[in-house]
């Protein structure tokens, strides 16, 4: 009679994480009598996966009724596969005895595990940057297998080319991580822009994962200032406006100075938003020219988003206006909302 053979027909099996893996094993004879055991690996530290005779293996079930006397199919199903289950599995026939002794082994089945990458997380620089500067964005995704993965960067749908990507570890592992750094040049129009990291992997069936970062959290568009003198409202009053244009974010503090002395400080509140996401704001100052003997230097000083102040000055010629005697008020705090001006 032909000696018993242990047949593992599948050289390799690939399973998605979370699914069950079926490892096939049949024997060609009922003799000798004895149990089957499954092992992962084959060296001195091999790991027992299933023992037909005894033990508790909650994730392992037999595919056929292995307790039947005539059974020759010892295939097993391992549930809820994770990347840590990858390896080579051996179906081993034992000869009954005290103790049971190993008799024959199958050729082994290599189990590889496909695991989905985590949702990509995109993070930008810690501090805001101004247009024309280059900033770096990072994208990370973890826990995928196999190692092959594709990562692309986009800015508003346009693919970026200036990036570097690493997949770790360098060699084989039960699962992998990807880390990519992209360089993006900011423009004044980028408040509404998005940077997108897109990850494609065999487990995603053509539906890539995306992570996004809004450039509104990264960009700082400094304001442009314009100080203008409005037509005289009364004989002794001049209306001076400071137009603060195209700034982002909104955090802005404006100070009026008369000949270097602080006249009024206010915070931008009711702003108007431009189509590109930047803001405009206007502050105005009523100057009582009769209170001044000499020309007045009016300065609009703006501190934007905690940055060093920028300013614009306007020289008010006092000599051009008749002086009203008895007035001791240099300025009236009558408004700063541009909608009140016109």
């Amino acid at each position: 009679e032909e000696e018993l053979q242990v047949i593992q027909p599948d050289k390799s099996v690939s399973v998605a994480a979370g699914e069950s893996a079926i490892l096939h094993c049949t024997v060609t004879s009922l003799i000798p009598v004895g149990p089957i055991q499954w092992f992962r690996g084959a060296g001195p530290a091999r790991e027992l996966i299933y023992n037909q005779k005894e033990g508790h293996f909650p994730r392992v079930t037999t595919v056929s009724e292995s307790t039947k006397r005539e059974n020759m199919d010892f295939s097993i199903s391992i549930s809820n596969i994770t990347p840590a289950d990858a390896g080579t599995y051996y179906c081993v026939k034992f000869r009954k005895g005290s103790p049971d002794t190993e008799f024959k082994s199958g050729a082994g089945t290599e189990l590889s595990v496909r695991a989905k990458p985590s949702a990509p997380v995109v993070s930008g620089p810690a501090a805001r940057a101004t247009p024309q500067h280059t900033v770096s964005f990072t994208c990370e995704s973890h826990g995928f297998s196999p190692r092959d993965i594709t990562l692309k960067w986009f800015k508003n749908g346009n693919e970026l080319s200036d990036f570097q990507t690493n997949v770790d570890p360098v060699g084989e592992s039960v699962s992998y991580s990807i880390h990519s750094t992209a360089k993006v040049v900011l423009t004044r129009e980028d408040v509404h822009s998005q940077v997108i990291c897109e990850v494609a992997h065999v487990t995603l069936q053509g539906d890539p994962l995306r992570g996004t970062a809004n450039l509104s959290e990264t960009i700082r568009v400094p304001p442009t200032l314009e100080v203008t003198q409005q037509p005289v409202r009364a004989e002794n009053q001049v209306n001076v406006t400071c137009q603060v244009r195209k700034f982002y974010p909104q955090r802005l503090q404006l100070t009026w100075l008369e000949n270097g002395n602080v006249s009024r400080t206010e915070t931008a509140s009711t702003v108007t938003e431009n189509k590109d996401g930047t803001y405009n704001w206007m502050s105005w100052l009523l100057v009582n020219v009769s209170a001044h003997r000499d020309d007045v230097k009016l300065t609009c000083q703006v501190e934007h988003d905690g940055q060093p102040a920028v300013s614009k000055s306007h020289d008010l010629k006092v000599s051009a206006h008749p002086k009203e005697q008895g007035s001791n008020t240099a300025a009236e705090n009558t408004g700063s909302n541009e909608r009140n001006i016109y």
Epitope: G41, A42, F103, S173
Partner: antibody, heavy 123, light 107 residues
Framework: QIQLVQSGPELKKPGETVKISCRAS????????MSWVKQAPGKGLRWMGW????????TCADDFKGRFAFSLETSATTAYLQIHNLTNEDTATYFC????????????????WGQGTLVTVSA | DIVMTQSQKFMSTTIRDRVSITCKAS??????VAWYQQKSGQSPKLLIY???NRYTGVPDRFTGSGSGTDFTLTISNMQSEDLADYFC?????????FGSGTKLAIK
């Protein structure tokens, strides 16, 4: 195809140190453990120990503890055997040999071998 | 350590002969045994693993058998290219150990 290519022969004096390299190609280096095997002239094979190429952890057989060290340069897919304070008894051919099992936690048999590096120790 | 004894240091054979090389383990190693062929000046070549499983590409005239402590490598139809040293190896426990080898020569 899978290849293990070892560095060339070495002639050393007693007390010196030798470092042998084993460059792997044709497979992902850190999947499979790497063992080192000694064969003295006209003699049998002796397993010296192995290194887990994923973790970098090495295990030396008792007879080879002390003067023998296994190391890796993962980026170069290369394993190294270093022998310190050489003696005449270290004259042998040294083989690197790859484990059959991906993600294996112990070596078993060896389907792939380097061509061997002859180390001669002579005063 | 487990000692793998190959009592026949040399074996004389003829072409097309049937040759059996034996290996005895000093303690039970189950079926954790491999066999290698080594030709002069070359590295060993794996023939058999798990005592009886032929490695990929190995001609079917090579057969392994045995379990526990007694193992045999059989060459059923000796060819001239089979003249070499043959080593058994156990991987049941650390340290892995090899037999001292059996050299096949032509009568």
């Amino acid at each position: 195809q899978i290849q293990l290519v070892q560095s060339g022969p070495e002639l050393k004096k007693p007390g010196e140190t030798v470092k042998i390299s084993c460059r792997a190609s044709g497979y992902t280096f850190t999947t499979y453990g790497m063992s080192w095997v000694k064969q003295a002239p006209g003699k049998g094979l002796r397993w010296m120990g192995w290194i887990n190429t994923y973790s970098g952890v090495s295990t030396c057989a008792d007879d080879f503890k002390g003067r023998f060290a296994f190391s890796l340069e993962t980026s170069a897919t290369t394993a190294y055997l270093q022998i310190h304070n050489l003696t005449n008894e270290d004259t042998a051919t040294y083989f690197c040999a790859r484990d059959p099992h991906s993600y294996g936690n112990s070596p078993a048999w060896f389907p792939y071998w380097g061509q061997g590096t002859l180390v001669t120790v002579s005063a | 350590d487990i000692v793998m004894t190959q009592s026949q240091k040399f074996m004389s054979t003829t072409i097309r002969d049937r040759v059996s090389i034996t290996c005895k383990a000093s303690q039970n190693v189950g079926i954790s045994v491999a066999w290698y062929q080594q030709k002069s000046g070359q590295s060993p070549k794996l023939l058999i693993y798990s005592a009886s499983n032929r490695y990929t590409g190995v001609p079917d005239r090579f057969t392994g058998s045995g379990s526990g402590t007694d193992f045999t490598l059989t060459i059923s139809n000796m060819q001239s290219e089979d003249l070499a040293d043959y080593f058994c190896q156990q991987y049941s426990s650390y340290p892995l150990t090899f037999g001292s080898g059996t050299k096949l020569a032509i009568k």
